[in-house]
Amino acid sequence: GITIPRNPGCPNSEDKNFPRTVMVNLNIHNRNTNTNPKRSSDYYNRSTSPWNLHRNEDPERYPSVIWEAKCRHLGCINADGNVDYHMNSVPIQQEILVLRREPPHCPNSFRLEKILVSVGCTCVTPIVHHVA
Amino acid sequence: GITIPRNPGCPNSEDKNFPRTVMVNLNIHNRNTNTNPKRSSDYYNRSTSPWNLHRNEDPERYPSVIWEAKCRHLGCINADGNVDYHMNSVPIQQEILVLRREPPHCPNSFRLEKILVSVGCTCVTPIVHHVA
């Protein structure tokens, strides 16, 4: 069979765990962007489905701080500034990748993990179930 | 500051690039979740600030497919189903981590990268600038 040309600068793959365990360069591209959503926009306050941002911190994870959105109301804010319960505030969720130290306390050994986070809230028309 | 005790089973970190280059186990936790947001919820259609989901695919990145939200309207949908331009549909953005093969053709070498993605849209009260 054809063999793919291997880059001569590749790290060694004789590790018995290869290819599950790989080398990852943590010198992140675009890492100087602002990760605190409160500083990057005030949508969480101005939205008709406003949310609070909760700091989720885990020193054994990278990134160690993740901001989680929690909708302030079950309903949405109407034009009068009151909560309208004919509409629903719901969290918009996204799966993200994080690195978790494994084994714990190892400075240079991680495991890839997918977690579901709430990024913000949106106002939706409810699904009404009619009882027969 | 407190120093975390080092786990005796940690891999060797004598690499001159340490701690920028780390070992990562890619056997992902929670990997059986659904990554297509269209299948996981219909908020994108039911929201007062509805959005379309665009497929952003990059064959050299993990995850290779990321769904990007684009707000359908500048305004928001009112109770009559019309677009109300006194309100604004805005994207909720989040920074996520992705892995990129680097250098190319190395089966076990990656670089961590941060990218900004739009996850969904929310309806906000506009900021009105009064001209003096």
């Epitope: - | 990059d58 064959p59 050299e60 990145r61 497919v65 093969r101």
Partner: antibody, heavy 120, light 112 residues
Amino acid sequence: QVTLKESGPGILQPSQTLSLTCSFSGFSLNTFGMGVDWIRQPSGKGLEWLAHIWWDDDKYYNPALESRLTISKDASKNQVFLKIANVDTADTATYYCSRRELGPYFFDYWGQGTTLTVSS
Amino acid sequence: GVLMTQTPLSLPVSLGDQASISCRSSQSIVHSNGNTYLEWYLQKPGQSPKLLIYKVSNRFSGVPDRFSGSGSGTDFTLKINRVEAEDLGVYYCFQGSHFPYTFGGGTKLEID
């Protein structure tokens, strides 16, 4: 050495469901960055991409056929499956599976193909 | 989807000559990451396709240097210097920059 081999029923009648199997060796779908695609080729015609499955069970389909396609895998048996519902004479073709790896190119290894004839 | 149009449909050549195959896409296939995922495959009679060129101009492992790819945006070319008997078959271009992925209709390289 990477090898892939397709198997299927050979002949089907219209409206039946086609079940194809791709058996492979030399790589694992438990490995990060590995995937398998299905591509078909009607006799004497060009190639059409059908579907793809990644090691983490992410699946993608050609939108033109998506409603009829189902791709799945059994990584422990080194097999990938493709089902096509409600076949028609237009589905008469040679079906190939190919390996894809997360990286700069797409289909680096292909199977020999399995031929399907849809006839009443 | 992106339509890939190959010309000519058939290309008669003499052994030792140069062959040139054109592939045109209905829209730019430059990916948002800056790369162009344009590939060339050769399908010899009775065989499955084999990857020759990826990302417009990179030769895949084991592919002789008489094969070269070039082009950008929407226009791409595969050149074969000094055609040998083993090069005969149908050549397909393929784009992986935009979903769904699409192949060209093929160009048959045959002996003049």
